[in-house]
């Protein structure tokens, strides 16, 4: 789930740096004024833009939820990067939640891979060496990932 928004309530502060658009676009770290005449810098730690754009407002920085740790803080050109805390992981199929890693392998199986923020433990049969994937209980905590636009996967 992406938490990106162009917030119409927020207006540029007087101290923000301004420059002229190039080919009608503003560089990363900026947004455009409503009359298209100026590029206005995003506010560090509050909002950002990753590409050349003509956004009327910069994108709001993601705030990591409880159950997540902040790996990289938000800059004017990059969103916050949040990661599942130790003992939990985020699956590609359900990136909106951190799931609890399994504590061990079923009988007759051996652990070959530890829990990481991106994957559960991996178990294989002692004899055959074939993988085993079990159902994992979901942690009741919704979390967010970095911008999910096609051009800017950040986590």
């Amino acid at each position: 789930i992406t938490r990106q928004s162009l917030d119409p309530q927020r207006r540029a502060a007087p101290q923000q740096k301004r420059s002229s658009p190039t080919e009608g676009l503003c560089p990363p770290g900026h947004h455009i004024s409503e009359d298209s005449r100026e590029c206005i810098s995003c506010k560090y730690g509050q909002d950002y833009s990753t590409h050349w754009n003509d956004f009327l407002f910069c994108l709001r920085c993601t705030k990591c939820d409880s159950g997540e740790v902040e790996v990289n803080s938000c800059t004017t050109t990059r969103n916050t990067v949040c990661q599942c805390e130790e003992g939990t992981f985020r699956e590609e199929d359900s990136p909106e939640i951190c799931r609890k890693c399994r504590t061990g392998c079923p009988r007759g199986m051996v652990k070959v891979k530890d829990c990481t923020p991106w994957s559960d433990i991996e178990c294989v049969h002692k004899e055959s060496g074939t993988k085993h994937t079990g159902e994992v209980p979901a942690v009741e905590k919704t979390v967010t990932t970095s911008p999910g636009t096609p051009a800017s996967p950040c986590s």
């Epitope: 162009l6 050349w52 003509d54 956004f55 051009a151």
Partner: nanobody, 126 residues
Framework: EVQLLESGGGLVQPGGSLRLSCAAS????????VGWFRQAPGKGREFVSA????????YYADSVKGRFTISRDNSKNTVYLQMNSLRPEDTAVYYC???????????????????WGQGTLVTVSS
Amino acid sequence: EVQLLESGGGLVQPGGSLRLSCAASGRTFGSIRVGWFRQAPGKGREFVSAINRNDGTTYYADSVKGRFTISRDNSKNTVYLQMNSLRPEDTAVYYCAAGLQYNRAADRVPVGAVYWGQGTLVTVSS
């Protein structure tokens, strides 16, 4: 929050026409340019057209130039895509997009967007 709502898709015969509409349900599209992308079955999303809502400058993919026309009605907060001389290869889900993103200032084709509509299906078949 910017929300985009497309309409106007449907089934049409080769050579026929359709007009797609994209309305911003909030107060704004959130950006000066608004565009259309499409995704054919089993293919990636591709840029179709965009318009600058301030000055009316238009941008088109080569595959639709001369057949598709993008326009806007700022009073209605709506952007239109008039599609003429439709071909079977135009069959796709068409998405309205705002907050277009570019790798370079000189680029005419955006690499992505922040806001997307839910899409409207256009089927060109006899």
